[in-house]
Interface confidence: medium
């Protein structure tokens, strides 16, 4: 850049770029000021005057520094199924999760969950795997010799048999092992 | 590199239309602004207007608004400019331009030739 | 619209000589002046943008001045390569305007 040139705006020299948090305007030909997160354009600079931000009204944000036209809008309040982990700001989108006992079905662009669903319960002779599915739901494993689950639940694993000194019923994947009374 | 790459020279009849492209190669087309640029046979150099690469919005020096019109496809880093109902005095090189302050790469100029 | 007024339309001079070429705005222009060189069957050629500003790759010798109305492209020491037409224009307003251009000949 010339050394005279500072302030925006300015004429950059031709071809070359703005620098950081500052952008291009074709229309001006200048390298003219972004506005801040929480804030948008509300005058285009020109020749001789920068840009003219202000503040996104209620229930609108930008979280990047911008040049636009217009704040962006929050998404609608979380819904019964879900908890709100991070508010709608001036400077942030609302971000919602699910409650317990719910997955995320189908996610937004910012990571907020968009509609829960019920989490899948994993039957007699089946535990709940330590890992998730890629939509985050319940994946559910058969009992491996050894271990069992008699419940149909979303959170119970596959627990050992227990050991017995004498035993009376082998158990299986589904109930547990019976031990012999001790005489 | 940077390089504007002009369609080749047309020899059109009176009231035809002509549509000459510029093809933008080595940087981000949609930052830069378009320039057009007419040239009549050993004339000087005539400020035709420009189209704003993001928005896709032309501007027209009032001699230039009706029978022309600037275009683009982006997908393509490709800006058009149009004429119709063509005379014997729009005879000239056309150039597209990047930029408008200070117009650093040029096109290399097509010549449209309008003869009966 | 602004009219660029460029003197001499021609100007005579041998290699190694000062070659000043002037252009007048009919309005204030700030210093939104640009100087273009053209050579036969070429497209211009950038040389200053600013009224004052070197464009990248272009020899020292070759220096813009002025602002408002009045501006000067000089070339200190005439090349042979340097024989050509040379064009201001302005950008401060719409329409955007060339002067008529100065034909730089050798004597």
């Known amino acids: 850049l010339p050394a005279q040139v500072a302030f925006t705006p300015y004429a950059p020299e031709p071809g070359s770029t703005c620098r950081l948090r500052e952008y291009y305007d074709q229309t001006a030909q200048m390298c003219c000021a972004k506005c801040p997160p929480g804030q948008y354009v509300k005058h285009f600079c020109n020749k001789t005057s920068d840009t003219v931000c202000a503040d996104c009204e209620a229930s609108m944000y930008t979280q990047v520094w911008n040049q636009f036209r217009t704040c962006l809008s929050c998404s609608s309040s979380c819904t019964t199924d879900q908890v709100e982990i991070r508010a709608c700001t001036k400077q942030q989108n609302r971000v919602c999760a699910c409650e317990a006992g719910r997955y995320c079905a189908l996610k937004t662009h910012s990571g907020s969950c968009r509609q829960c669903m019920r989490l899948s319960k994993c039957g007699p002779g089946f535990g709940v795997a330590s890992s998730r599915a890629p939509n985050g739901n319940v994946l559910c494993k058969a009992c491996a010799p050894g271990t069992f689950s008699d419940t149909t639940s979303s959170t119970d694993v596959c627990r050992p048999h227990r050991i017995c000194s004498i035993l009376a019923i082998p158990g299986n994947a589904s109930t547990d092992a019976v031990c012999a009374p001790e005489s | 590199q940077i390089q504007l790459v002009q369609s080749g020279a047309e020899v059109k009849k009176p009231g035809a239309s002509v549509k000459v492209s510029c093809k933008a190669s080595?940087?981000?087309?949609?930052?830069?602004?378009m320039s057009w640029v007419r040239q009549a046979p050993g004339q000087g150099l005539e400020w035709m207007g420009w189209?704003?690469?993001?928005?896709?919005?032309?501007t027209y020096a009032d001699d230039f608004k009706g029978r022309f019109a600037f275009t683009l496809d982006t997908s393509t880093s490709t800006a058009y400019m149009e004429l119709r109902s063509l005379r014997s005095d729009d005879t000239a090189v056309y150039y597209c331009?990047?930029?408008?302050?200070?117009?650093?790469?040029w096109g290399q100029g097509t010549l449209v030739t309008v003869s009966s | 619209e602004i009219v660029m007024t460029q003197s001499p339309a021609t100007l005579s001079l041998s290699p190694g000589e000062r070659a000043t070429l002037s252009c007048k705005a009919s309005?204030?222009?700030?210093?939104?002046v640009s100087w273009y060189q053209q050579k036969p069957g070429q497209a211009p050629r950038l040389l200053i943008y600013?009224?004052?500003n070197r464009y990248t790759g272009i020899p020292a010798r070759f220096s813009g001045s002025g602002s408002a109305t009045d501006f000067t492209l000089t070339i200190s020491s005439l090349q042979p390569e340097d024989f050509a037409v040379y064009y201001c224009?302005?950008?401060?307003?719409?329409?955007?305007?060339f002067g008529q251009g100065t034909k730089l000949e050798i004597k």
């Open positions: 331009a990047r930029g408008l302050y200070g117009v650093d790469y």
């Open positions: 080595g940087y981000t087309f949609t930052t830069y602004g």
């Open positions: 224009g302005q950008s401060y307003t719409y329409p955007y305007t």
């Open positions: 600013g009224a004052s």
């Open positions: 189209i704003h690469t993001y928005s896709g919005v032309p």
């Open positions: 309005e204030n222009v700030v210093t939104y």
